[in-house]
């Protein structure tokens, strides 16, 4: 009821707290001498439900029966309306609609750690919309009982603040929770448990790892646990993995040997504990320990490839290339690569350690049989050396793969296909597909890429270091013993018409014909592999169609003769370039007049 109503009263029957669906009677009555002046029968009492008028009556009192009230609180206000004046509030009352508490479900209790306190949780069931008090009761041996009350509106957790001890771990305790509100009460089913059932150990702490003799094969994990712990679960994984390895151990006493860790790998370790084989629950996982395992000497062998370049009649340049070992093969930080070059007949050998590169270039005589060995070294040792005999990779024409083609295969991929060589195809031990960006100068600094393919394969998809709109020189080598044959082709993953035409830099006259020289189109403007150049010419000031000459593209070519010009006629000449996607715009225009005699 609104406090201290001077003018009248509002009463609610049977109660101001009702069960959902119940009916209430509301009475508004004026106190003596509180009605309208002069004419009491002019009193008009009006009942409002919040701000909505629901009933009115002339006289000293008003009765109203109300049904269908919603869950929660509804305010009823009674007002008096007199002629020629505003309504005035007489009194008001709230009605609280709710439900009795449901039976609390799934009562469960836990004690965190041997020194912790007993705390219980339960499910309240549906909201009562009324103030509901929860009382938790725990009874134990020797008629001991503890009780705790919860005054939080959404109470589903209580801590008794008492500690169960392991003196009699099999003694039974019983917990029960009771919910009470103005409309009723309800108790949970009792939950009976022992010390071992409810004590959840604290997670292990102070986790450490030791590697005896800095070896990954002698690894022990150490930790600390509460005194009564019997079981442990260990889980560990490489830091970059989502999958855990799991180990269960009994009576570990804070240590366990791990035998299957990979070298030079950062691992994450966690441990959990339990007091009893089949009673109680596992602790939370411990905080993670992160540790890197020691290095081991590399396994596997380097993938090595090479290029030979003729320098002069007595010398040749050898460029060696190799790929990094995978992390699992390197098993540590590679400190250097050891390259040994040996002349097989004379026995002369030269060894060099290479750091920071995966290539090495040297100059050797063109005579003799040469071999190289390359290995990778970390702090623990070296990989087995990869040995290669240096030979002329393209010398055996009969071993050359046939019908080599290179086709775009989606974004930044090129599919290279070939047919086996004419010579007995079964003699091929492996194919090597090599590719590098095409540079008109034949630049030896351009990075080399390669992949190896089994002898029964006749195609390879190359995707490493492939960029759109770049032309690649692709070679396929067939290797057999100490012989090799090769075929080459140009290819690109994506192409469009070149952005510019060649720049004519000179036109010279030679015996009645002309020689046109041009500068190559910059690589970044070629937009793929060039197929042809076109030279156009027409008489100056003429409207006739130009004549043209189409020249197949060759990397090293940058001049071409034309012998169909008339003497003493001034011509305008220009050039374009073509890829499979189309023709470039014109290059620069040059004028030229042939001075030779007319026939």
């Amino acid at each position: 009821k609104i406090d201290a109503c001077k003018r009248g009263d509002v009463t609610v029957k049977p109660s101001h707290v009702i069960l959902l669906g119940s009916t209430v009677n509301i009475t508004c009555s004026l106190k003596p001498r509180q009605g309208c002046f002069h004419y009491s029968r002019r009193n008009k009492l009006i009942l409002y439900k919040f701000d909505r008028r629901i009933n009115f009556h002339h006289g000293h009192s008003l009765n109203s029966q109300v049904t269908g009230l919603p869950l929660g609180t509804t305010l009823f206000v009674c007002k008096l309306a007199c002629i020629n004046s505003d309504e005035i509030q007489i009194c008001g009352a709230e009605i609280f609609v709710g439900v009795a508490p449901e039976q609390p479900q799934n009562l469960s209790c836990i004690q965190k750690g041997e020194q912790g306190t007993v705390a219980c949780t339960w499910e309240r069931g549906r909201d009562t919309h009324l103030y509901t008090e929860y009382t938790l009761q725990l009874s134990g041996p020797k008629n001991l009982t503890w009780q705790k009350q919860c005054k939080d509106i959404y109470c589903d957790y209580l801590d008794f603040g008492i500690n169960l001890t392991p003196e009699s771990p099999e003694s039974n305790f019983t917990a029960k929770v009771t919910a009470v509100n103005s409309l009723g009460s309800s108790s949970s089913l009792p939950s009976t448990f022992t010390f071992l059932d409810i004590v959840r150990p604290l997670p292990p702490w102070d986790i450490r790892i030791k590697f005896q003799k800095a070896s990954v094969s002698r690894c022990t994990l150490y930790w600390r646990d509460e005194g009564l712990v019997l079981l442990n679960r260990l889980r560990y994984r490489p830091s970059n993995s989502r999958l855990w390895n799991m180990v269960n151990v009994t009576k570990a006493k804070g240590r366990h040997d791990l035998l299957d860790l990979k070298p030079f790998t950062e691992y994450e370790f966690q441990i959990s504990s339990k007091l009893h084989l089949y009673k109680g629950s596992w602790s939370d996982w411990s905080e993670s320990l992160r540790a890197q395992t020691p290095e081991e000497e590399p396994t596997g062998m380097l993938d090595v490839w090479y290029m030979k370049r003729h320098i002069d009649y007595s010398r040749q340049q050898i460029s060696l290339f190799w790929k990094n070992l995978s992390v699992s093969e390197a098993r540590g930080k590679i400190l250097h690569y050891q390259v040994t070059l040996q002349e097989l007949t004379g026995g002369k050998a030269m060894t060099q350690n290479i750091t920071g590169h995966t290539s090495w270039t040297t100059v050797i005589p063109r005579t003799g049989n040469w071999a190289v060995a390359v290995s990778a070294a970390n702090s623990k040792g070296s990989s087995l050396p990869t040995r290669i005999n240096i030979m002329n990779l393209c010398e055996a024409g009969l071993l050359a793969p046939r019908q080599v083609s290179a086709n775009s295969e989606g974004m930044d991929n090129i599919l290279v296909t070939w047919q086996p060589p004419r010579k007995d195809p079964s003699a091929v031990q492996e194919y090597v597909v090599e590719w590098r960006e095409l540079h008109p100068g034949g630049d030896t600094q351009v990075p080399l890429n390669w992949l190896r393919s089994r002898p029964y394969n006749v195609s390879a998809l190359i995707s490493e270091n492939i960029k759109s709109y770049i032309c690649y020189e692709i070679r396929v080598y067939a290797l057999s013993g100490d012989q090799g044959g090769c075929s080459s082709i140009l290819g690109n993953s994506k192409h469009k018409a070149p952005l510019s035409g060649p720049h004519i830099n000179a036109i010279t006259e030679e015996k009645g014909s002309i020689l046109i020289s041009w500068n190559s189109i910059p690589v970044q403007e070629q937009m793929g592999c060039l197929l042809h150049y076109r030279i156009y010419w027409k008489e100056r000031d003429s409207n006739s169609q130009p004549q043209l000459c189409e020249i197949p593209y060759r990397v090293s070519q940058n001049s071409h003769p034309i012998n169909s010009l008339q003497p003493r006629v001034t011509y305008v000449l220009w050039m374009t370039a073509l890829t499979a996607a189309g023709e470039s715009s014109h290059g620069n225009e040059r004028e030229f007049c042939l001075q030779g005699k007319a026939n």
């Epitope: 406090d3 101001h16 929660g72 609180t73 305010l75 709230e94 919309h129 103030y131 005054k151």
Partner: nanobody, 115 residues
Framework: QVQLQESGGGLVQPGGSLRLSCTAS????????MDWYRQVPGNQREWVAS???????YYDGSVKGRFTISRDNAKMMVYLQMNSLKPEDTAVYYC?????????WGQGTQVTVSS
């Protein structure tokens, strides 16, 4: 124990605005309505506005269209935004939480509308 504290009252000219706030403590508030009442000296307290836990507002006819009630359950606050104030709105304004165990009232904040 629930405690309520109003603030934001003051002197304002007719036609002006004020915003009253009521800070509450105690978690039971989240299931109950929160109300504003006002009292002129010598008269009884009169209901002004209510808001349900889900935010449904209700107003007395004398303030409807001028006052707005709102609540922030996370901060346990209820507000009364009063616009187009009139001299007859002068009163002490109280915040109230009605429960089935009894009503909780604040101490009140004075609002004076005068030129």
């Amino acid at each position: 124990q629930v405690q309520l504290q109003e603030s934001g009252g003051g002197l304002v000219q007719p036609g002006g605005s004020l915003r009253l706030s009521c800070t509450a403590s105690g978690s039971i508030l989240s299931i109950y309505n929160m109300d504003w009442y006002r009292q002129v000296p010598g008269n009884q307290r009169e209901w002004v506005a209510s808001i349900t836990p889900s935010g449904d507002p209700y107003y007395d006819g004398s303030v409807k269209g001028r006052f707005t009630i709102s609540r922030d359950n996370a901060k346990m606050m209820v507000y009364l935004q009063m616009n187009s104030l009139k001299p007859e709105d002068t009163a002490v304004y109280y915040c109230k939480v009605p429960t089935e165990k009894g009503n909780y009232w604040g101490q009140g904040t004075q609002v004076t509308v005068s030129s």
